[in-house]
């Protein structure tokens, strides 16, 4: 109840001189607090900026290709706890991009030892039409890549509730959510706990029995009556995502070699690629079986390396 606001009448008293002295002291205190507040706000802003910058440094955006999955078998759970969650894990390895500059080429051999041999010889004379071109073979300096496991758990006991209206105090809203989600008429069931966050207007409802969450999730919305107004809150599966075995790796490619020194060539890239391929196929040139050649004579190209 509103701190007895309606229960007691406030009596106004005449001010004594002592009270005015107190007022002056209070005014000074308020000014001091206000200054401190401004100072703290500035500090918070500064720290928030630093935090944002730090966060950006540790963010990785990767376009992960779509993967086709093969369904192998049905597992018979040993106990009920295995039924309370659906879990799956994905191994994610990022491809490492490398920019091939103008006048450069990348050549990938089938065997590592061939690549190593080409690099150790360093200088190679390649016949390109009527020009005998000296190219330099170097290891490919790669940026770091990442490898990690994404572990996803979809709960069969919990649900997420969003778009909860901010119409009640926190304790009352918790009660109201539990009450509403326990109604079997709407597919609900006995509620174990409610974790409600008023600020975000969301909650996590944990049920006592398996299967209740599934029933509720058959619909995307759920009715919540507050003072005769029916609010429709949004329900969605509760998932927990963990990042595991996060590894950052770097190094040089074992089968791919960087060729430089072709800046002056004005020819079709595909023709040059064929000529490089022919040259490095020959054992007498220190080469061997070639997998692929990618050449850049105009615009730089991006090549992606994977494990």
């Amino acid at each position: 109840m509103e701190a007895d606001k309606d229960d007691t009448q406030q009596i106004l008293k005449e001010h004594s001189p002592d009270e005015f002295i107190k007022d002056e002291q209070n005014k000074g205190l308020i000014d001091e607090i206000t200054k401190k507040n401004i100072q703290l706000k500035k500090e918070i802003q500064k720290l928030e900026t630093e935090l944002q910058e730090a966060t950006k440094e540790f963010q990785i955006k990767e376009d992960i290709p779509e993967t086709k999955m093969k369904f192998l078998s049905v597992e018979t759970p040993e106990n009920d706890s295995q039924l309370s969650n659906i879990s799956c894990s994905f191994q994610v390895s990022s491809k490492v991009p490398y920019e091939i500059q103008k006048g450069q080429a990348l050549i990938t051999f089938e065997k590592e030892e061939v690549a190593q041999n080409v690099v150790s010889m360093s200088k190679h004379h390649v016949q390109i039409k009527d020009v005998n071109l000296e190219v330099t073979a170097k290891p490919v300096p790669l940026n770091s890549g990442v490898r990690f496991q994404v572990y996803v758990e979809v709960s069969k006991m919990k649900i997420n509730v969003t778009e909860i209206p901010d119409t009640l105090r926190e304790d009352q809203m918790r009660d109201k959510l539990e009450l509403s989600f326990s109604k079997s008429r709407n597919g609900g069931g006995e509620v174990d706990r409610v974790d409600y966050d008023r600020q975000s207007g969301s909650a996590v409802i944990t049920f006592v029995e398996i299967g209740v969450a599934d029933k509720i999730l058959k619909k995307k919305e759920y009715p919540l009556y507050i003072n005769q107004t029916c609010h429709r809150v949004t329900v969605s599966p509760y998932t927990e995502i963990h990042l595991k075995k996060y590894q950052i790796f770097s190094g040089t490619s074992k089968r791919t070699v960087l060729l430089t020194g072709m800046e002056g060539i004005q020819m079709d890239e595909e023709i040059v690629e064929d000529l490089i391929n022919i040259h490095f196929q020959r054992a007498k040139n220190g080469g061997g079986e070639v997998d692929v050649v990618k050449c850049s004579l105009g615009q730089p190209h991006i090549a992606y390396f994977e494990e």
């Epitope: 509103e2 009352q172 009660d175 326990s182 009556y225």
Partner: antibody, heavy 124, light 112 residues
Framework: QSLEESGGDLVKPGASLTLTCTAS?????????MCWVRQAPGKGLEWIAC????????TYYASWAKGRFTISKTSSTTVTLQMTSLTAADTATYFC?????????????????WGPGTLVTVSS | ALVMTQTPSSVSAAVGGTVTINCQAS??????LAWYQQKPGQPPKLLIY???NLESGVPSRFKGSGSGTEYTLTISDLECDDAATYYC??????????????FGGGTEVVVK
């Protein structure tokens, strides 16, 4: 389904007393608030406090009862009311009541189950 | 605080007659109003919830109506057994205060 209050007694002013409400035929669930209501001799009904019977166990008090009265859920079938610094004005029959949610299509409530009451007399 | 004001404090009517009891809330209670009947030495009995919904087992002679802050209980075809004290009550969820609960002062119905 029934409720029964116990613990009513004749006590001196300033004393403390704990009343217990025991439910039979049902156990507390998310659809109820368990409450205490009192009635002074020859007077009307006066709400004291409620506790949510669901998992949160939220408590709500009448403004005059805050600080002196404490409602608690001690099991899935019992609720207590602790009263301190009792005065003659607290002399009354104390009822335990179940406030039920009729919220099939609205936010409706009603005390649909009452105990017979227990008498508390504060006198020197 | 939620305050329920009930009028009149006492009313008398003959058997077969009709009585009307009024209840005014200090704020909008969104039809979340209940009516109770109490006989001496007994606990109250719920008659109506949600302003107009009859609790099971309660005769249809009891009729509740109203909205917002004004509510009415009408008892028609009065019977001797209807002699009792009647109370209105409401509980209200709130965004700024505790969940409040309040009873009206009661109306004594005398059947002649």
């Amino acid at each position: 389904q029934s409720l029964e209050e116990s613990g009513g007694d004749l006590v001196k002013p300033g004393a403390s007393l704990t009343l217990t409400c025991t439910a039979s035929g049902f156990s507390f669930s998310s659809s109820y608030y368990m409450c205490w209501v009192r009635q002074a001799p020859g007077k009307g009904l006066e709400w004291i406090a409620c506790i949510y019977a669901g998992s949160s166990g939220s408590t709500y008090y009448a403004s005059w009862a805050k600080g002196r009265f404490t409602i608690s859920k001690t099991s899935s079938t019992t609720v207590t009311l602790q009263m301190t610094s009792l005065t003659a004005a607290d002399t009354a029959t104390y009822f335990c009541a179940r406030e039920y949610s009729y919220d099939d299509y609205g936010d409706f409530w009603g005390f649909n189950l009452w105990g017979p009451g227990t008498l508390v007399t504060v006198s020197s | 605080a939620l305050v329920m004001t009930q009028t009149p404090s006492s009313v008398s009517a003959a058997v077969g007659g009709t009585v009307t009891i009024n209840c005014q809330a200090s704020q909008n209670i969104y039809t979340n109003l209940a009516w109770y009947q109490q006989k001496p030495g007994q606990p109250p009995k719920l008659l109506i919830y949600g302003a107009s919904n009859l609790e099971s087992g309660v005769p249809s002679r009891f009729k509740g109506s109203g909205s917002g802050t004004e509510y009415t209980l009408t008892i028609s075809d009065l019977e001797c057994d209807d002699a009792a004290t009647y109370y209105c009550q409401s509980s209200l969820y709130s965004r700024i205060a505790d969940r409040a609960n309040a009873f009206g002062g009661g109306t004594e119905v005398v059947v002649k």
